[in-house]
């Protein structure tokens, strides 16, 4: 059976035998030997005491002495199974082996969990030589054991191509609970459930958990490890922890903070980026999301004229990036403008609305009715239109751009004149007779020059005609203009 | 399925003591609190502690110390309530009722009738 | 300790009516439970942790509140629903029942 001793065993050898292990890291030693780490071994050695060999693997040497004697067998006498000690605690353990003097050149390797420890370890191997034999005693040491420590240590042996392997020596380090799952931080929907995980082991086990909610503990007796805490649901913000408990004392998990998901705060700080006349690009800053993302916002625009219906239009855009060109919009006009995003719990309230206006722009229509007729007397071509909708002027008119093409004999130019914005008619110069005259009108302001009227053309005769009749931009829904005479 | 039985009511007299026990089934005993529970003639529930089966150790509501222990005998999963020196301000209903997470009292005894009457 | 105060003490409905039951607390507390009570009966656990049915329970309960004010609600009362309604804390030992609300057949 495998010998166990705990940490807590009284300062004495505990087992028969020449040379036991370390039972336990705190005892006065009786007799010292020179170790690397200036660690002092536990229990006393006397190597040369007949020991027990043990029943594991052991090598029949093929050598006889003088007498003809066949050698004993060869094996590592037993020491302690099982070693128990707290965290950061010094342990010190051996093996040893009485070998027969024909035998030079062995050396004692140590392994843990089937590897073997090269390098840095506090291992020191020391020889008593006898007359026959030589014990030989391999220490292992760890000056402050961690977790990582935990596992089967063994010594093995070669000699004359046999390997020789001692029991294992199985070190156990206990020590407060370690967490391997811990809850996490979450956002929650108010009133529904929801699940934390708590898991910690030892050694020792068991491990036990409470579950902690804003202090107050949640489970009134212990729960084995893992441990799944269901939340029937909060309605504020709640902070969670676990407290998992063995033999050696508790550890207390980080407390998370679950947050109840809400309607995200209202966007702040609208600011105009740029006006066009028929456009404003805004941005905002989002509010507080209210623990859930954004998923979309409304851009809400109404007009500041009093006289207007009140109206709101409303435009849809993605969260990101918090910009938005509003379109479609009047030139020369007063807008209000409100933004409010949404994330899967609601809308926010609005902004607080910010006045925004367009700038002047090119009018959106031509001139209307423009009528064109040839005064033959004063030889001049007269021209008459109306005026575009003022909504649709988009600014102050500033005047109106006339152009005239004459058209002769495949001869063609055109002309353009400037004429203020007062009345709403003009007189050109006849430029060629036997012509075609065509002509367009463009109204102007500062956004600048809105588009041509449907094109009217008139015939200037040659001299000596009698009459003409004026022409006309077409009545809308014909398709050409008409030309009469 | 879950079960909290209660022993018969009792009649007593001023001074003497009296043991209710409340016998657990269809779960495991010490993975659940006891708690104890007083209903006097005509008015209300009143919390009067728990056992922790798991430790047993007890935890005593303000006005139920001294005169009242709550003891436990897991190997036959039975939380007890015994009340010395009795007083006639003592005939009440008694209930024990399993203690779920959040002290919530998921399955209750049918309750004992503790009569102290001279 | 967490003094809990039931309202109104009794409340006298027909079948089929609405009741509400309030219950407030002293301080603040995570959790609301709720049980039901008929005479020479052990009280039986109606909603768990504020708003969660117990189980048999039927859905004409229902449960809300948070912070100090706690309501129960029967929908539409049943004969079978005429009884005394105790609430209970969770937050802070000791553990505190209120005073009960009667519901009686009006």
């Known amino acids: 059976a495998i010998t166990e001793a705990r940490e807590e065993a009284k300062p004495y050898p505990l087992f028969p035998g020449p040379f036991p292990g370390s039972l336990q890291t705190d005892h006065t030693p009786l007799l010292s030997l020179p170790h690397a780490s200036g660690y002092q071994p536990a229990l006393m050695f006397s190597p040369t005491q007949p020991g027990r060999p043990h029943t594991g693997n052991v090598a029949i040497p093929q050598v006889t002495s003088v007498e003809s004697k066949p050698l004993p067998p060869l094996a590592f006498k037993h020491t302690v199974g099982h070693i128990i000690l707290s965290e950061h605690k010094g342990v010190k353990f051996n093996c040893s082996i009485s070998v027969p003097n024909i035998y030079q050149d062995t050396t004692i390797s140590w392994w843990k969990d089937g590897k073997e420890l090269l390098g840095a370890h506090h291992a020191i191997t020391q020889f008593y030589p006898d007359d026959e034999v030589t014990a030989i005693i391999a220490s292992f040491s760890i000056t402050s054991v961690q977790r990582s420590d935990n596992g089967s240590y063994i010594c093995k042996m070669k000699i004359n191509n046999e390997e020789i392997v001692s029991d294992p020596i199985y070190i156990e380090v206990q020590g407060l609970p370690h967490f391997t799952k811990q809850p996490e931080s979450m956002n929650v929907t108010r009133n529904t459930a929801f699940n934390l995980t708590c898991q910690a082991v030892g050694p020792p086990e068991p491990v036990n958990i409470f579950w902690v909610q804003n202090s107050s503990r949640v489970n009134e007796q212990p729960e084995k490890s893992p441990s799944v805490l269901t939340v029937p649901g909060l309605t504020e913000m709640a902070v969670f922890s676990c407290e998992a408990h063995n033999d050696k004392g508790l550890t207390v998990s980080k407390g998370v903070q679950i947050n109840i998901k809400a309607i995200p705060s209202p966007p702040t700080e609208v600011s105009i980026r740029n006006s066009t006349a028929h456009s404003i690009l805004i941005s905002w800053v989002p509010g507080f999301d209210g623990y859930s993302p954004f998923r979309n916002c409304s851009i809400q625009v109404k007009e500041a004229d009093p006289l207007s219906n009140g109206s709101v239009m409303i435009f849809n855009t993605s969260a990101l990036p918090h910009l938005y060109q509003i379109k479609q919009l009047q030139a020369l006009a007063n807008y209000s403008i409100g933004v409010s995003c949404m994330n899967e719990i609601g809308w926010s309230a609005v902004s607080p609305w910010i006045l925004a206006s367009t700038t002047e722009g090119a009018p959106s229509v031509a001139p209307l009715n423009v009528t064109v007729f040839l005064n033959e007397s004063s030889d001049n071509v007269d021209i008459r239109w109306m005026k575009p909708p003022t909504k649709q002027q988009d600014g102050e008119l500033v005047g109106y751009r006339i152009s005239h093409v004459w058209q002769s004999a495949g001869i063609s130019k055109e002309l353009l004149e400037e004429v203020g914005q007062n009345g709403s008619r003009a007189r050109i110069s006849v430029q060629v007779h036997n012509a075609t005259c065509t002509v367009r009108i463009a109204a102007v302001t500062r956004g600048g020059v809105g588009p041509f009227s449907d094109p009217v053309k008139i015939f200037i005769p040659a001299h000596g005609w009698v009459d003409y009749a004026p022409s006309s931009t077409p009545a809308p829904g014909n398709a050409d203009p008409v030309l009469i005479i | 399925q879950v079960q909290l039985v209660q022993s018969g009511s009792e009649l007593k007299k001023p001074g003497a003591s009296v043991k209710v026990s409340c016998k657990a089934s269809?779960?495991?005993?010490?993975?659940?609190?006891v708690h104890w529970v007083r209903q006097a003639p005509g008015q209300g529930l009143e919390w009067m502690g728990w056992?922790?089966?798991?430790?047993?150790?007890?935890t005593y509501a303000q006005g139920f110390t001294g005169r009242f222990v709550f003891s436990l005998d897991t190997s036959v999963s039975t939380a007890y309530l015994q009340i010395s020196s009795l007083k006639a301000e003592d005939t009440a209903v008694y209930y024990c009722?399993?203690?779920?997470?959040?002290?919530?009292?998921?399955?209750w005894g049918q309750g004992t009738l503790v009569t102290v009457s001279s | 300790e967490i003094v809990l105060t039931q309202s109104p003490a009794t409340l006298s409905l027909s079948p089929g009516e609405r009741a509400t039951l309030s219950c407030r607390a002293s301080?603040?507390?995570?959790?609301m439970h709720w049980y039901q009570q008929k005479p020479g009966q052990a009280p039986r656990p109606l909603i768990y942790?504020?708003?969660n049915l117990a189980s048999g329970i039927p859905a004409r309960f229902s449960g809300s509140g948070s912070g100090t004010s706690y309501t129960l609600t029967i929908s539409s009362l049943e004969p079978e629903d005429f009884a005394v309604y105790y609430c209970?804390?969770?937050?802070?030992?000791?553990?505190?029942f209120g005073g009960g609300t009667k519901v009686e057949i009006k």
């Open positions: 301080s603040s507390v995570s959790y």
């Open positions: 056992g922790n089966t798991y430790t047993g150790e007890p």
């Open positions: 209970q804390q969770w937050s802070s030992n000791p553990r505190t």
């Open positions: 009722a399993r203690g779920n997470r959040y002290a919530y009292m998921d399955y």
């Open positions: 269809g779960y495991t005993f010490t993975n659940y609190g």
């Open positions: 942790a504020t708003s």
